[in-house]
């Protein structure tokens, strides 16, 4: 067991003339917070898998108000470390996602609004007990500097936190076959950590995590006596050399426990010990709750306020998967005609048409547009004998040469707030609404679809929406 620790050093605009404006203003003060999600790095888990190694949410940072006319500085950060405890061995290679969130503290009715500012990800090799590792990453116009480490919780030591150390029983030396624990030379390496639950009386191990049985005992944890009463035992036929000690097919054969659960035999059947995040007779049900923040890309988490009710992520347009982690490849349906290029902007599909074609799906043949140039990916469209440029997101003007404010068209419904974002725009919805453009009421039929908040978590807290 141990703890992964993340220290955020700075979050601010990257260098260069294209630096972003501050995310806060005098009218809308705000503060930052961070979320980290960890997964084992070399497992072939799907991108949508939950944060199998754990996740953590930081405290809120100090309130920040932009000084008019001043460039955006590094923004004030929350105090302290983000800590993700891990129960089992540290995997050595891990994947991380770090998200930077903004909490607005303006006069929103019903409490603050949240929006995602930046997200960085990576896969790294890291030994537990080693020094802090540093990283610098860019996400859009922002730059994040951070350090991380994994440390073992006593008495565990070693690069994977699988060895145990105990104070010496004798002042001069360790017991038979046990070495001093570097760097704690005054402590001794304890016997190997066997598989969790391995019988101390009837089992032993030569490698961490295994459980080998003494003669007369069987089962994954060496807790089941081998039957010697009758060679007609339901556990299998006798053996000429070992009498009745050869076990036949047992209830744990083939491991009926799903999702990495470990099986132990009981007198009547078997029992599954499930890893964190799963439950059920065979560990077949995900026990992740909304409090774990399992929904990505602005997905809304519903249900699962306690481990006995599974959660569901309601995904915004453009995303799918059990955790809203997969971008829907709507371009695979080839919606753009006449050789148009399909762009999936997440909130909408856009067809970038070849010269001479226009319309939402490039369905209009416009010969008179052939000689007209629309800059920055704009498309020439005909209207009543004239032609004009339909500009790509972020551009405007007659020829799409002017930078446009993507929020100018007030795209966020139901009082949602619009923010220009490095990949387009982001809507921070008023309480009671969801979706990329705040177009969906959370409780259309009058009954709230949001579950009761878990202890210590207000309804609508961002942990529910990650």
């Amino acid at each position: 067991a141990g703890v992964f620790e993340l220290q955020i050093h700075s979050f601010g605009p990257g260098p260069g003339p294209g630096a972003p404006r501050s995310p806060c203003s005098a009218r809308l003060p705000c503060r930052l917070f961070f979320r980290v999600c960890l997964k084992p790095g070399l497992s072939e888990e799907a991108a949508e898998s939950p944060c199998a190694l754990g996740a953590a949410l930081s405290a809120r940072g100090p309130v920040y108000t932009e000084q008019p006319g001043a460039p955006a500085p590094d923004l004030p950060l929350p105090d302290g470390l983000l800590q993700v405890p891990f129960r089992d061995a540290w995997p050595g290679t891990f994947s991380f996602i770090i998200e930077t969130w903004r909490e607005e503290l303006g006069d929103q009715i019903g409490g603050p609004a949240w929006s995602l500012l930046a997200r960085v990800a990576g896969r790294r090799r890291l030994a537990a007990g080693g020094p802090w590792a540093r990283d610098i990453q860019r996400a859009g116009a922002w730059e994040l500097r951070f350090s991380y480490r994994a440390r073992c919780e006593p008495p565990a030591v070693g690069t994977a936190c699988t060895r145990l150390c105990r104070p010496r029983s004798a002042p001069s030396r360790c017991g038979p076959g046990l070495r001093p624990c570097a760097p704690l030379e005054d402590e001794c390496e304890a016997p190997l950590v066997c598989r969790a639950g391995c019988s101390p009386e009837h089992g032993f191990c030569e490698q961490p995590g295994e459980c080998r049985c003494l003669e007369g005992w069987t089962g994954p944890l060496c807790t089941v006596p081998v039957s010697t009463s009758s060679c007609l035992s339901p556990r299998g036929p006798s053996s000429a050399t070992t009498g009745c000690l050869v076990p036949g097919p047992g209830p744990c054969d083939g491991n009926p426990c799903a999702n990495g659960g470990s099986c132990s035999e009981t007198p009547r059947s078997f029992e599954c010990t499930c890893p964190r995040g799963f439950y059920g007779l065979r560990c077949e049900v995900s026990g992740v709750t909304c409090a774990d923040g399992p929904c990505f890309n602005g997905g809304l988490c519903v249900g699962g306020a306690d481990p006995d009710s599974a959660y569901i992520c309601h995904c915004p347009p453009g995303f799918q998967g059990s955790n809203c982690e997969k971008r829907v490849d709507r371009c695979s349906l080839q919606p753009c005609r006449n050789g148009g290029l399909c762009l999936d902007l997440g909130h909408a599909l856009r067809c970038r048409c070849r010269a001479g074609f226009a319309g939402p799906r490039c369905e209009h043949d416009l010969d008179d547009c052939a000689g007209r140039a629309c800059a920055n990916g704009g498309t020439c469209v005909e209207g009543g004998g004239a032609h004009r440029c339909s500009c790509a997101l972020g551009f405007g003007g007659r020829d799409c040469r002017e930078r446009a404010d993507p929020c100018a068209a007030r795209p966020c419904a139901h009082g949602g707030r619009c923010y220009a974002h490095f990949s387009g725009l982001v809507c921070a919805c008023a309480p009671g609404y969801m979706g990329a453009r705040c177009e969906f009421p959370v409780h259309p039929d009058g009954a709230s679809a949001l579950p009761a908040a878990p202890p210590g978590l207000r309804p609508g807290d961002p942990q529910r929406y990650l």
Partner: antibody, heavy 117, light 107 residues
Framework: QVQLVQSGAEVKKPGASVKVSCKAS????????IHWIRQAPGQGLEWMGY????????EFNQNFKDRVTMTRDTSTSTVYMELSSLRSEDTAVYYC??????????WGQGTTVTVSS | AIQLTQSPSSLSASVGDRVTITCRAS??????LAWYQQKPGKAPKLLIY???SLEDGVPSRFSGSGSGTDFTLTISSLQPEDFATYFC?????????FGGGTKLEIK
Amino acid sequence: QVQLVQSGAEVKKPGASVKVSCKASGYTFTRYWIHWIRQAPGQGLEWMGYINPTTVYTEFNQNFKDRVTMTRDTSTSTVYMELSSLRSEDTAVYYCAHGGSNFFDYWGQGTTVTVSS
Amino acid sequence: AIQLTQSPSSLSASVGDRVTITCRASENIYYNLAWYQQKPGKAPKLLIYTANSLEDGVPSRFSGSGSGTDFTLTISSLQPEDFATYFCKQAYDVPPTFGGGTKLEIK
């Protein structure tokens, strides 16, 4: 304006070592990492490793781990990359680049290293 | 190490054409992909980072898209100075790796 200026071309014999320098200017030297990338004639790009000038921490591509050394001199804002036990396949243009882990935004002009007997 | 496969390896086009280059990663790299332009005898120049962010000073005719394993670099209207070799680079895992390059030539 960020600038990285590298040392001149080198011709070396197999088994020898080469030390290439990269002098940085136009920014706070310790604020960003310096990466080294090489490109054999007519080939693609291969990352060799980086040095964090603040901590002198280095990380290398396993392909070069036992042969490459990276050092820095903060007084002159210069980073050095030394490659030992040279072989003919080390003939390449060696570039230094300024950045973090997911961006190399400014590059040196390159140093040609020829390994020939 | 993560492998990046670029296609096509070479491409002939004319000034004013719209050009698309693709890069496929051997596994999910989220949005950790950058695009570089290299002209003969010169160092590579960063165009796009984190899949779709345009580096300062790069003309807006360059754009990047994609996430996960499939990425695209698009030049909306080729200019004479755009004829060069283009490389993609993943920065999700260590070591960072580059695609084999796409040589863009004048038709």
